[in-house]
């Protein structure tokens, strides 16, 4: 089966999250700095004529690009979009930011910057004070905080106001930790890396963050082309060669927000075996509640049979049996010269009772709605009242 | 630069506040740490104040310590002192995109619990 | 909770000689590590960082090496400036869930 059964649609995780209809409260709108009270974080918000009309930093946002305005979602969010405006005051304001940069961080201890997939943290923003310009974030970021760090070319006022679109990232996935992605030499180079990865990279390994195994675009069957515009070969994957593993197998790790019971992966892999790609022959799993216990009982184990000669990119089911956990380590065993992976997802429930992981003194903050519903592996937020998504832009995933 | 003070002579179970004071950066973009030494001892690990308000400590700490922090200083309050809190307490200053090591360190200020 | 065992805990050696110092994990640190000197009666000094890193203005004659549970500073063409106590400190991080650091005990360097 290709399908991934429940898995989330990035195309309709697009939701206004909060900052025009107050849902998100003031208490979680800061700033580095504000002009005046009368410009102060609270009034950033996108339509809004609150205050002055804007937020403003007290600072000059030139040369040094370091005032900010930051939005707590309290919650992990995959953010797909951003809207911006200057500062109107009913066409007294002239004030506004031709060019900004974002940073997120899922526990407001790590920041990330956000690039695009060219590698480019810098995005094009206003050209007036009373314009709303959407930035599609290709690729998205899963955040509970994010900050907006306007820039200048020059000494100068500048000014926000802003919305985030995006949904609940209910998967729980923080981060997951893998060998790097190699290239495969065809008649082309295909780049099999996680080319949006946003954690460290420190001898051949990858660990703390999330990319492309975790950002709902799955991969077509020939690995060599892409759902992306303007990439290069295997962009889709993450990709294996078993020359590199003389242990037979990769191996994984994936930490999660809280202790969930763990019904079954499911990863979606590349079949294309005349080009060496093959599903993996066996997954070997092993699970603990916390990052410094001992791996719990027996590795569930499961050997992948089926349709093997059929070339096409499908989704493998990895059953794991309720089993408790916090953190969970993978061994993809090689069936062939290739293991080429482009999501990798989980169908789990949170465990009663089980307060989030996000230790520390953080403002509490309700980690699910009143009576968590099992996530029932959908990271998409049940559709809000009354609201409808934002479209994306035609023929342009990442406009 | 960063600074500490407040550091001086305390009974057991007097409420003591030390300041860590920083200028020439701002704490809305670094994280600061907490670190204390006993007379002739190494070093010690007490928490951090992230620049996003959130506070973690060391497992020993909790419940001993309370970190908080305002546009330029992060106090660290020792809750309940005892003896074994005599020590120096140092102000840190994290990495800007490198939350794993302490780059900037203030001189120290002086605790001493003794009745 | 993040232990860091280091060893040992004094060494001595001559003016333009070698010191080893090791330093080990509880947990895997993936190269969250840092070294310090201390002198006495000053603050630590940051020797390297990201295990292996130096910060501008310190010598190369420090080398950090080391990944996982296991790292180690080399100090080379010893001189008598060196003569001071030496801390590693590790990070235990995972994805946004758990942060905890940890000193070693110190390593006493006596420069003959």
């Known amino acids: 089966d290709a399908d991934m059964k429940g898995h989330f649609d990035p195309a309709k995780c697009r939701y206004a999250l909060g900052m025009q209809d107050r849902t998100i409260p003031d208490s979680d709108i800061s700033a580095s700095s504000s002009w005046s009270d009368s410009t102060a974080a609270r009034h950033s918000r996108l339509e809004s004529s609150d205050g002055d009309g804007a937020w403003c930093p007290a600072g000059s946002v030139f040369p040094k690009e370091e005032e900010y305005l930051q939005v707590d979602l309290q919650r992990l969010h995959l953010v797909a979009l951003v809207g911006t405006q200057g500062r109107h005051a009913g066409g007294l304001g002239k004030e506004f930011s031709r060019s900004y940069r974002l940073r997120y961080s899922r526990d407001g201890r790590r920041w990330m910057g956000w690039k695009d997939r060219w590698g480019q943290e810098v995005i094009s923003g206003n050209e007036d004070p009373e314009g709303v310009v959407l930035k599609d974030l290709g690729p998205p970021m899963v955040a509970r905080l994010v900050r907006f760090y306007p820039r200048a070319d020059r000494v100068m006022s500048v000014c926000l106001r802003v919305e985030l679109y995006g949904c609940l990232w209910r998967d729980g996935l923080l981060s997951y930790t893998a060998p790097v992605g190699q290239t495969m030499y065809l008649s082309e180079a295909v780049y099999l890396n996680d080319s949006t990865y946003d954690g460290h990279t420190v001898g051949g390994l990858q660990y703390g963050g999330l990319g492309q195994l975790a950002d709902g675009v799955v991969g077509l069957d020939d690995f060599r082309k892409s759902q992306e515009l303007r990439v290069w070969p295997g962009y889709d994957y993450v990709g294996w060669s078993n020359h590199s593993f003389s242990s037979g197998y990769v191996e994984m790790e994936f930490e999660f927000d809280r202790l969930r019971a763990f019904q079954a992966m499911q990863v979606h892999c590349n079949n294309m075996h005349t080009l060496g790609a093959r599903l993996p022959g066996g997954v070997e799993c092993r699970f603990r509640r916390g990052p410094a216990m001992a791996w719990e009982g027996e590795p569930m184990r499961h050997n992948l049979g089926g349709n093997l000669g059929d070339p096409r990119a499908r989704a493998v089911s990895v059953p794991l049996g309720g089993r408790v956990a916090r953190f969970l380590q993978c061994r993809f065993l090689f069936a062939g010269p290739w293991l080429l992976f482009s999501e990798i997802s989980f169908i789990s429930d949170v465990v009663n009772n089980s307060s989030p992981a996000l230790g520390g003194t953080f403002p509490p903050a309700p980690w699910w709605p009143p009576g968590p519903p099992p996530t029932n592996f959908s990271s998409l937020e049940l559709e809000p009242r009354g609201q409808q998504p934002v479209a994306k832009a035609e023929g342009s995933p990442t406009a | 630069s960063v600074e500490e003070s407040g550091g001086r002579l305390v009974t057991p179970g007097g409420s003591l506040t030390l300041t860590c004071t920083v200028s020439g950066f701002s704490l809305s973009s670094y994280d600061m740490s907490w670190v204390r030494q006993a007379p002739g001892k190494g070093l010690e690990w007490i928490g951090i104040s992230w620049n996003s308000g959130f506070v973690d400590y060391a497992s020993w700490a909790k419940g001993r310590f309370s970190i908080s922090k305002t546009s330029t200083t992060v106090d660290l309050k020792i809750t309940s002192p005892t003896t074994e809190d005599t020590a120096t307490y140092f102000c840190?200053?994290?990495?800007?995109?490198?939350?794993?090591?302490?780059?900037?360190w203030g001189p120290g200020t002086l605790v001493t619990i003794s009745s | 909770e993040l232990v860091m065992t280091q060893t040992p805990a004094s060494v001595e050696a001559a003016v333009g000689g070698t010191v080893t110092i090791k330093c080990q994990a509880s947990e895997t640190i993936s190269s969250r590590l840092a070294w310090y000197q201390q002198k006495p009666g000053q603050p630590p000094k940051l020797l390297i960082y990201q295990a292996s890193k130096l910060p501008s203005g310190v010598p190369s004659r420090f080398k950090g090496t080391g990944s996982g549970t296991e790292y180690t500073l080399t100090i080379s063409d010893l001189e008598c400036a060196d003569a001071a106590t030496y801390y590693c400190q590790g990070c235990y991080y995972g994805g946004g869930s758990f942060y905890d650091s940890a000193f070693g005990g110190g390593t006493e360097v006596v420069v003959k």
């Open positions: 840190a200053r994290l990495g800007a995109d490198d939350i794993y090591y302490f780059n900037l």
